[in-house]
């Protein structure tokens, strides 16, 4: 699931999530994450994979929050 395109690059935090991924991304594939802008119509956590893909996820999913905690701790 891609985020809205941006002229400033694929990971610019002004992007919004319009749909969420329906599958759990393996933790080892994730390099970084960011939260979408609070002005977006729906919230989103964007995970950036080691291959450079941006994946929109639902912040209310437990695995998403678990990954965020893990990345904050490490």
């Amino acid at each position: 699931t891609k985020t809205e395109s941006s002229s400033r690059g694929p990971y610019h935090p002004s992007e919004c999530c319009f749909t969420y991924t329906t599958y759990k991304i393996p933790r080892q594939r994730i390099m970084d994450y960011y939260e979408t802008n609070s002005q977006c119509s729906k919230p989103g956590i964007v995970f950036i994979t080691k291959r450079g893909h941006s994946v929109c996820t639902n912040p209310s999913d437990k695995w998403v929050q678990d990954y965020i905690k893990d990345m904050k701790e490490n």
Partner: antibody
Framework: QSVKESEGGLFKPADTLTLTCTVS????????INWVRQAPGEGLEYIGW???????YYASWAKSRSTITRNADENTVTLKMTSLTAADTATYFC???????????????WGQGTLVTVSS | AVVLTQTASPVSAPVGGTVTVKCQAS??????LAWYQQKQGQPPKLLIY???KLASGVPSRFKGSGSGTEYTLTIRGVECADAATYSC????????FGGGTEVVVK
Amino acid sequence: QSVKESEGGLFKPADTLTLTCTVSGFSLSSFAINWVRQAPGEGLEYIGWISDVGTAYYASWAKSRSTITRNADENTVTLKMTSLTAADTATYFCAGGDGSYSNYWVSDIWGQGTLVTVSS
Amino acid sequence: AVVLTQTASPVSAPVGGTVTVKCQASQTINNRLAWYQQKQGQPPKLLIYEASKLASGVPSRFKGSGSGTEYTLTIRGVECADAATYSCQEYADENIFGGGTEVVVK
């Protein structure tokens, strides 16, 4: 494990609503709290939630006038909603979940709810 | 946004009978659906999550099924205590609830 909402009451249009959810028997550091409301005779409506790490998220309709905060030391979560109108008349529930059901929106611990009436 | 349309109220069943409540989503929600029971003056009680999994402490006479956009809650061997309003919730997209279906037990 339980959650309880503070007293609601009668509000005037344009007032600001502040409700507090007090949790007992568990820590907010491992639980998320949702706010949901129900207008008389109507279905349930999600307002927003705060995660176990303290980040708040909102329904699109509520975002512009709602704020959810927490005090982990006192085990309380507060909902503040500004610019009330008659359409905000409802029973307001706080509900908790620890993610056991794979998603924090799925709540198995609910308060009894508190009635908020907005009328001039 | 997803819209959830439930079976119109009321739905009646005799004690010992079977009740079926349907919940139709306006788009696929990948089994991210929960069912709640709510009695008059009480908060909702979680019954089913992920479309078909029974929440802790819920009697096995409650069964959830479905996929894609069509979901069903079935109550077999209905008891007087099952008289309530049943609501579905999607948590795939925006955390939307259905309008509720009242079940009357005769």
